[in-house]
């Protein structure tokens, strides 16, 4: 190999050992029979050398540094050449470095021809191995602007006071052009400006200077985004840290075309703007940091550019001004992540503040719109609290548990609407009365409606789930001792059509001791399946539940248990079941940890089933499933 560097070229070539490998045989640079491991060639020098091994690329790397001085004379602006040409260099991993020094008042602009650049974060690498490392200077301090790969959106980077650009090419890469040019500009009065150009839909992830280390103190950095007018851009912060400011405030500023409030100033912790049409700028402004404990300012963010959807021009009014203690959240429904680009799906408040989820609270009227290619990617969860603090005022008071029509008219599917029902302890209980009798969801008879009511205790220490209930059954009412949550959960988009079937009234009633009482009025010819609360985990310790089962005068009810023994083993206390005829008060008592469960029994009159649990030994929980079937009395039951 022969490398000859022209005089005054300000180029230095350095061949040195790369990352040590575990190769058995060492390799040397051979110059007139001398074996060396490092070779430096300066401007005006010509050197002939060879390598002592077959694969020098496994041992050595080459650095070609060109110093460009714009302080003492005119700068060589224009397209930057790879000098010496890659064809003259040995096939080693090579790094071309251009170090440009300029006055503080001069702006320097790196322009990248297609393919543009894509910034990568710490620990990431470029698929083709070609990386661009760009740094700037503040006085004597080097500032890393970032590391970039090909195939991105970054088209220009403007700096002042100097720039250092390192292009790393793997030994096997055929590239023979730098891919960028340098131009001079007037002072940019900030650390740097990065221009990012979107031709169509896509995303870009960008980082503050020195990321993941701290952004230089009291500096300003700007990103300029070029977005076709027919597309919409949204910004989301992926990661940020704030330093400890002594003076001024760290912030981001947006210059958004058409905005009457430019620049729009946001804190880093704020929701960032979305649904922006056309070009916009984003600037990061640091502060004067506390000398004792500076902390670090850093920011990693994403810009997502996509087509506006039909929905994005539609404004929906969600009027929660007459609601109390209610919150509505629109959020992405959980999905498996796909590798390909997925357009963002945002919900926007007042068309500008867009984010992947949004929570609206009661007491106001909200205007929302959507920036989303497919609204089925979002769903809604609502929580409302109905509480009674004064038992004298609440007793016998009723509330309708209905999803407000404003919410049903939104183009997003309702997932859960939860009512938290709170009562004063040991003073009042609750009764739920459905508009249509309910069926309890069981494996034997699952609910197949578009929605169900999930009823569970709302007492933090109590793990008690009464069950899932849907319209079209035999449960006329559910009484519960204390605080509960009732969640209307939808299972199909057809809920919109079936919404009229929803309707539950809750009333505050005098306190009673049992955890729950189900009033069941079976319909003729249908088998009613009932099961104890907390089916999968077992009825909680010392909990008692009852079923009040009505038997019409001309019918007889068959009560059937689905296993021979309850399976419960009591550690302390008693587990028992009482089956009591309501007319005669005659009762049968069964010890659930001693007795076999009763064989199918026939009841000519309304009756109670009461199940009370002990404190079971672990793994020996109380779970009972039973059914009630009505048949006409005329049938001979013998």
């Amino acid at each position: 190999f022969e490398i000859a560097l022209p005089r005054e070229s300000n180029i230095t070539v350095l061949i040195k050992l790369g990352t040590p490998t575990l190769l058995a045989k060492p390799c040397y640079i051979v110059i007139s029979k001398r074996h060396i491991t490092m070779l430096s060639i300066k401007s005006g020098e010509r050197i002939v050398f060879t390598f002592s091994c077959q694969s020098p690329e496994n041992h050595f790397v080459i650095e070609i540094q060109k110093n460009i001085d714009c302080m003492s004379g005119p700068c060589p602006f224009g397209e930057v050449q790879l000098q010496p040409s890659t064809s003259l260099l040995p096939t080693l991993n090579r790094t071309f470095i251009w170090d440009v020094k300029a006055h503080k008042s001069i702006g320097l602009e790196l322009q990248f021809s297609i393919p543009r650049l894509r910034q990568i974060g710490p620990g990431e690498s470029c698929p083709d191995g070609v990386t661009h490392s760009i740094s700037g200077r503040i006085d004597a301090t080097v500032v890393r602007i970032g590391t970039f790969c090909s195939n991105g959106t970054v088209s220009r980077i403007k700096m002042q006071e100097g720039v250092k650009m390192a292009l790393h090419l793997p030994w096997f890469h055929p590239r023979n052009v730098s891919g960028f040019s340098i131009a001079n500009r007037s002072s940019i009065k900030r650390l740097c400006i990065i221009e990012s150009v979107f031709e169509g839909e896509g995303s870009a992830t960008l980082m503050s200077a020195n990321y993941p280390e701290g952004f230089p103190e009291d500096e300003l950095m700007t990103w300029q985004f070029v977005v076709p007018a027919h597309l919409r851009a949204s910004v989301s912060f992926l990661n940020f840290n704030l330093s400890n400011c002594e003076r001024k405030e760290e912030r981001v500023e947006y210059y958004i075309p058409g905005s009457t409030t430019n620049p729009e100033v946001f804190k880093l912790e704020d929701k960032q703007p979305g649904n922006m049409a056309g070009n916009f700028n984003l600037s990061l402004q640091g502060c004067d940091q506390d000398a004792q404990s500076p902390g670090i300012l850093r920011l990693q963010f994403q810009v997502l550019v996509q087509h506006p959807q039909n929905e994005s021009n539609k404004i929906y009014v969600v009027d929660l001004s007459n609601e109390r203690a209610m919150s509505l959240t629109i959020e992405p429904r959980p999905v498996k992540q796909s590798r390909k680009f997925v357009p963002g799906c945002f919900v926007c408040l007042e068309s500008r503040t867009c984010s992947s989820n949004l929570t609206l609270t009661s007491g106001s009227k909200h205007k929302i719109s959507f920036l989303c290619d497919d609204l089925t990617r979002l769903w809604m969860n609502v929580e409302k609290t109905i509480s009674c603090t004064d038992h004298r005022y609440c007793q016998r008071k009723s509330y309708s548990l209905q999803v407000p029509s404003d919410i049903l008219h939104l183009p997003v599917e309702l997932h859960d609407f939860s009512w938290k029902l709170l009562v004063p302890k040991d003073r009042l209980s609750l009764v739920l009365v459905p508009a249509q009798k309910l069926q309890q969801h069981t494996h034997e008879k699952p609910c197949n409606t578009s929605f169900s009511y999930l009823v569970a205790s709302a007492i933090p220490s109590q793990d008690l789930y009464f069950g899932s209930f849907c319209p079209g059954g035999s449960i006329k009412q559910i009484q519960v001792k204390q605080n509960i949550s009732v969640t209307l959960r939808t299972f199909a988009p057809s809920f919109q059509q079936e919404a009229s079937r929803q309707g539950l009234t809750v009333s505050f009633i005098p306190y009673f001791k049992e955890e729950g009482v189900f009033t069941v009025t079976p319909d003729t010819k249908s088998k009613v399946y009932l099961r104890t609360p907390n089916w999968d985990r077992g009825l909680p310790s010392l909990t008692s539940v009852s079923w009040n089962i009505s038997v019409p005068r001309d019918q007889v009810a068959c009560l059937t248990f689905f296993k021979e023994r309850s399976g419960v083993v009591c550690q302390t206390g008693r587990a028992f079941m009482i089956i009591q005829e309501q007319r005669t008060r005659a009762e049968e008592i069964f010890s659930l940890d001693e007795d076999v469960l009763p064989k199918p029994s026939f009841h000519h009159h309304s009756f109670w089933v009461n199940i009370s649990n002990c404190s079971p030994t672990s793994g020996k929980q109380l779970d009972l499933l039973f059914s009630v079937t009505l048949t006409p009395r005329t049938v001979d039951l013998t």
Partner: antibody
Framework: QVQLQESGPGLVKPSETLSLTCAVS?????????WGWIRQPPGKGLEWIGS???????YYNPSLKSRVTISVDTSKNQFSLKLSSVTAADTAVYYC????????????WGQGTMVTVSS | DIQLTQSPSFLSASVGDRVTITCRAS??????LAWYQQKPGKAPKLLIY???TLQSGVPSRFSGSGSGTEFTLTISSLQPEDFATYYC?????????FGQGTKLEIK
């Protein structure tokens, strides 16, 4: 009306076995109840001896377990207590009582029978 | 075994007085506690079960409260027939145990 009546010898010699029976009237012994024995030495407090469920499951006071046997005879609607190797310390009024599962208390008691252990 | 400690062991009071007897369990027994009244030469009589439920036929001047380890029996206005010995009993776990008794005497 449910009644319980203890019967058995009032005097037992040391080292012998004390045997008492409790006859239940006005209620079937085989329906959701535990049946227990409790004793009370003269001038002292109450001590639970053991209980039996109608199915035959028994529960004994560990302090007496090695000497006590409780059994049930549903056909005669009665249950029995046997306490072996008695000593003077076993002298007491012996009560039989009904323990309703749903109540978890001895709600009905026999009037008691005094048993003296003496040679 | 669960120990039950009654206090006081002896109590002198007059007709019409309000009296309270305490029963303390050595470990939690939920509400599995019963109170009995015993008169000389007679079998004990159930007054209260499940810590606070009045047995049918028992005058309403008797009341029970508590759960866990601390329980009380209260007689709101003593009647002449209430002078007797009172026992608490736990039926939470075997072996069932009784308190040592509280003798209520006429002052």
């Amino acid at each position: 009306q449910v009644q319980l009546q203890e019967s058995g010898p009032g005097l037992v010699k040391p080292s012998e076995t004390l045997s008492l029976t409790c006859a239940v009237s006005g209620y079937s012994i085989s329906s959701g109840y535990y049946w227990g024995w409790i004793r009370q030495p003269p001038g002292k407090g109450l001590e639970w001896i053991g209980s039996i469920y109608h199915s035959g499951s028994t529960y004994y006071n560990p302090s007496l377990k090695s000497r006590v046997t409780i059994s049930v005879d549903t056909s005669k609607n009665q249950f029995s207590l046997k306490l072996s190797s008695v000593t003077a310390a076993d002298t007491a009024v012996y009560y039989c009582a009904r323990d309703k599962i749903t109540v978890a208390a001895f709600d009905i008691w026999g009037q008691g029978t005094m048993v003296t252990v003496s040679s | 075994d669960i120990q039950l400690t009654q206090s006081p062991s002896f109590l002198s009071a007059s007709v019409g007085d309000r009296v309270t007897i305490t029963c303390r369990a050595s470990q939690g027994i939920s509400s599995y506690l019963a109170w009995y009244q015993q008169k000389p030469g007679k079998a004990p009589k159930l007054l209260i079960y499940a810590a606070s439920t009045l047995q049918s036929g028992v005058p309403s001047r008797f009341s029970g409260s508590g759960s866990g380890t601390e329980f009380t029996l209260t007689i709101s206005s003593l009647q002449p027939e209430d002078f007797a010995t009172y026992y608490c009993q736990q039926l939470n776990s075997y072996p069932y145990t009784f308190g040592q008794g509280t003798k209520l005497e006429i002052k």
